[in-house]
């Protein structure tokens, strides 16, 4: 008989190399039976995982599994780091393995403006 516990299928030592300035979707595969659990994303800061507020998320349903998606539109250099999804199910908190994003800043160092120039780019 198949278990009806919620399971989060992020592989151990999962990682993604991505480019800043382009969109990216970070997926948390969620297996559940009846009621879809409440799932959240957090970002690791040392040993603490800080809950991500004000971030766009969505669900993608497939036949045997669902995905809770964290949207990066676009990826920023600050998004570099490790993330974890967690599910609340029958008063239990289930945490996934962490997944790491390695963000490459596509704007080369030579193209990077100085602090004084940085704000001036915002002029039409």
């Amino acid at each position: 008989k198949e278990s009806c516990d919620v399971q989060l299928y992020i592989k151990e030592q999962s990682e993604h190399s991505i480019l800043a300035g382009d969109p990216f979707e970070l997926e948390c595969p969620v297996k559940y039976c009846a009621n879809r659990p409440h799932v959240t994303w957090c970002k690791l800061n040392g040993t603490t995982c800080v809950k991500l507020e004000d971030r766009q998320t969505s669900w993608k349903e497939e036949k045997n599994i669902s995905f809770f998606i964290l949207h990066f539109e676009p990826v920023l250099p600050n998004d570099n780091g490790s993330y974890r999804c967690s599910a609340n199910f029958q008063s239990n908190l289930i945490e996934s393995h962490s997944t790491t994003l390695y963000v490459t800043d596509v704007k080369s160092a030579s193209e990077r403006p100085s602090k004084d120039e940085m704000a001036s780019r915002f002029w039409a």
Epitope: G21, D22, L76, P77, N78
Partner: antibody, heavy 120, light 106 residues
Framework: QVQLKESGPGLVAPSQSLSITCTVS????????VHWVRQSPGKGLEWLGV???????SYNPAPMSRLSISKDNSKSQVFLKMNSLQTDDTAMYYC??????????????WGQGTSVTVSS | QIVLSQSPAILSASPGEKVTMTCRAS?????MHWYQQKPGSSPKPWIY???NLASGVPARFSGSGSGTSYSLTISRMEAEDAATYYC?????????FGGGTKLEIK
């Protein structure tokens, strides 16, 4: 010097389609995203969608079914196509460059806009 | 979608007067951008990421806020500040703008 310039038909008949070209200079479409924003008296500023540097697109869900954004990196051009125009699509259409900093994203350089009137 | 409500819609201020306009979001956003637009021109970035002034923007302008409430303040109104100011969020698609605050000089 960063510049974006829109070119459009000006007048479009109802139910017809709209095609606008945005020609950019001073930056590469493989490094920066280009957005389409329109401004109408009735709806104010409305973000329509973006062509990301890697070639993916994101759209405003409301007009999404009528919208298509594409680009030609070699010609430094981004294209907006909108089908089934109605009178409330009458607006000034802007293409706008998007840029990221360490922890935020913003639209920085705006084109001068192209005025589109939907009328028979 | 996140709705941005700007108030007041029209604001009239005398030279030298302190001016504050607000932008309220229907859901929490990470930061807010502000654009200035004058008749016949494209919008110009004015304040980005809540409180950073764009280059050339006078120091009498400031921005603040967090969560669902943001504001733009002018410490001393000047004639050249007369324009429409729009807030804009880049937290959730569709990326929305406020309806604008039209600032007039008395």
């Amino acid at each position: 010097q960063v510049q974006l310039k829109e070119s459009g038909p000006g007048l479009v008949a109802p139910s017809q389609s709209l095609s606008i070209t945005c020609t950019v200079s001073g930056f590469s479409l493989t490094t920066y995203g280009v957005h389409w924003v329109r401004q109408s008296p009735g709806k104010g500023l409305e973000w329509l969608g973006v062509m990301w540097p890697g070639g993916r697109t994101s759209y405003n869900p409301a007009p999404m079914s009528r919208l298509s954004i594409s680009k030609d990196n070699s010609k430094s051009q981004v294209f907006l196509k909108m089908n089934s125009l109605q009178t409330d699509d009458t607006a000034m259409y802007y293409c706008v460059r998007g840029d990221y900093e360490y922890d935020y994203y913003a639209m920085d350089y705006w084109g001068q806009g192209t005025s589109v009137t939907v009328s028979s | 979608q996140i709705v941005l409500s700007q108030s007041p819609a029209i604001l009239s201020a005398s030279p030298g007067e302190k001016v504050t306009m607000t932008c309220r979001a229907s859901s929490s956003v990470s930061y807010m951008h502000w654009y200035q637009q004058k008749p016949g021109s494209s919008p110009k970035p004015w304040i980005y990421a809540t409180s950073n002034l764009a280059s050339g923007v006078p120091a009498r302008f400031s921005g603040s806020g967090s969560g669902t409430s943001y504001s733009l303040t002018i410490s001393r109104m000047e004639a050249e500040d007369a324009a429409t100011y729009y807030c804009h969020q880049w937290s959730s698609n569709p990326y929305t703008f406020g309806g604008g605050t039209k600032l007039e000089i008395k």
